[in-house]
Interface confidence: low
């Protein structure tokens, strides 16, 4: 099924409009902003949340402008282009005719330009690394645990195949969280990394996108794991393309 | 050729404000993040603060942020630092640097000459 | 703040011999460090870039090696011209931040 029978509602996407108007009445949702039909089984695509997150009105968004913590993704938020499948479109435009290319995940990868600036291809997002601080504790977590926590979340909150969490890396009070997923490891129905670290990001913000489920409460061995920031940087297949002699 | 030029330096009397411009040629500063750092005499550099000229967005260091203002003027491809309640201990070469986007890049790959500011009565 | 503290303040190095200058950095920055040197009047130079990346057109005898919190700047052999101050900076996050530099003399 692609959404919960009895209330209509998606699991996996709240920044969705669903009615009993699919085949046989079955319930079907639609997401905010671009009324594209989505997979309720599994998570929504990223550039679809953006998409949504930006035609919410302004007092019912409860994500503002990242801080500028948000270290890579520092353009902050913008109202994309998504393509049939829901994916990025490799170039973005604002509405006033600047324009940049983006990688698989939405993060701008080459200068801003004009309308003339051409961006070939989708380049894929490969490698995530999710950097966490949390809150002082009593005693360091056990690694161990730590890790084995952070893959069934990843797995059973987000779907994402164990084999794509590549490391746990843990230094008191740092913790890496090491996706990858290179284009041919990503089988049909795999949930795309970029969009389980954008899920997690979420969460951890206690901006939750899952359908009436409580927020994410992240213990090891009963100890709750409270993260005080998040910092995310992607590595593409193609090394962005800014226009610094390095990179020439 | 890649090249950022400061301007404004000079002696400043205490309590007054300083103005400093930076322009650039053989890059469009719309592209970059322009900064601003600093290095007192005989000292190590201080990083100041940063503006993204395409939309404005600044990043002050905490330790000015209630007297520096960072503003663009992309139709001359520059960005001007303004400083206000100058202090002796605020006597230094302030440099202009530009970085990328994204973290990854936000190293100094091209620097000013450099402009010396003396304040003192 | 991320602190950045290097060792040692001042290297006296024979020409022809190598030099290690270290970093540390106060918390985690992953490979987000750079290294800059500054000759005396003149402008910092970028030499070195995520850690280990060699900036165009730096000598190969300069390399960068490190991740987390401990960073080293090697010059495998010193050269007269290398006379400089060295400095690390971290580009992980804002505010950014330098050390506090190291004199690299010749012995």
């Known amino acids: 099924h692609t959404a919960a029978q009895d209330n209509c509602t998606c699991p996996t996407n709240k920044m969705t409009v669903c009615s009993p108007d699919g085949p046989g009445g079955r319930c079907q949702c639609r997401a905010l902003g671009s009324g594209m039909a989505v997979d309720c089984s599994t998570l929504t695509s990223k550039c679809l949340l953006l998409k949504a997150r930006m035609s919410a009105p302004k007092n019912a968004r409860t994500l503002v402008r990242p801080s500028e913590h948000a270290l890579v993704d520092n353009d902050g938020l913008y109202d994309p282009d998504c393509d049939p499948e829901g994916r990025f479109k490799a170039r973005q435009c604002n509405q006033t005719s600047v324009c940049w290319c983006v990688n698989s995940v939405g993060v701008r990868r080459t200068d801003k330009g004009d309308l003339s600036l051409r961006c070939d291809e989708l380049v894929r997002t490969h490698h995530i690394l999710i950097d966490l601080r949390h809150r002082p504790t009593a005693g360091a977590f056990n690694h161990s645990d730590l890790d084995a926590e952070l893959r069934r979340l990843f797995r059973e909150r987000y779907r994402l195949h164990p084999k794509f969490v590549a490391a746990v890396h843990y230094e008191q009070p740092t913790i890496q969280i090491e996706l990858r997923q290179n284009t041919s490891q990503k089988a049909a129905g795999d949930v795309d990394i970029g969009d389980a670290a954008y899920y997690f990001e979420r969460d951890i913000k206690g901006e939750s996108l899952f359908q009436g489920r409580g927020g994410l409460d992240l213990r090891v061995r009963g100890e709750p794991l409270q993260v005080e920031r998040t910092l995310i940087y992607y590595l593409d297949e193609i090394p962005p393309k800014f226009s610094m002699k390095r990179l020439t | 050729e890649v090249q950022l030029v400061e301007s404004g330096g000079g002696l400043i009397q205490p309590g007054g404000s300083l103005r400093l411009s930076c322009a650039a040629s053989?890059?469009?500063?719309?592209?970059?993040?322009m900064n601003w750092v600093r290095q007192a005499p005989g000292q190590g550099l201080e990083w100041m603060g940063r503006?993204?000229?395409?939309?404005?967005?600044?990043h002050y260091n905490q330790k000015f942020k209630d007297r520096l203002t960072i503003t663009k003027d992309t139709s001359k491809n520059q960005v001007v630092l303004t400083m206000t309640n100058m202090d002796p201990v605020d006597t230094a070469t302030y440099y202009c640097?530009?970085?990328?986007?994204?973290?990854?890049?936000?190293?100094?790959?091209?620097w000013g000459q450099g402009t010396t500011v003396t304040v003192s009565s | 703040d991320i602190v950045m503290t290097q060792t040692p303040l001042s290297l006296p190095v024979t020409p022809g011999e190598p030099a290690s200058i270290s970093c540390k950095a106060s918390?985690?920055?992953?490979?987000?460090v750079a290294w800059y040197l500054q000759k005396p009047g003149q402008s910092p130079q970028l030499l070195i870039y995520?850690?280990?990346y060699r900036y165009t057109g730096v000598p190969d005898r300069f390399s960068g090696s490190g991740s987390g919190t401990d960073f080293t700047l090697t010059i495998s052999s010193l050269q007269a011209e290398d006379v400089a101050v060295y400095y690390c900076?971290?580009?992980?996050?804002?505010?950014?931040?330098f050390g506090q530099g190291t004199r690299l003399e010749i012995k």
């Open positions: 053989g890059f469009t500063v719309s592209n970059y993040w």
């Open positions: 995520s850690a280990s």
């Open positions: 900076q971290q580009h992980y996050s804002t505010p950014l931040t």
């Open positions: 503006i993204d000229p395409n939309d404005s967005e600044t």
């Open positions: 640097a530009r970085s990328g986007f994204g973290s990854t890049y936000w190293f100094f790959d091209v």
């Open positions: 918390q985690d920055v992953s490979t987000a």
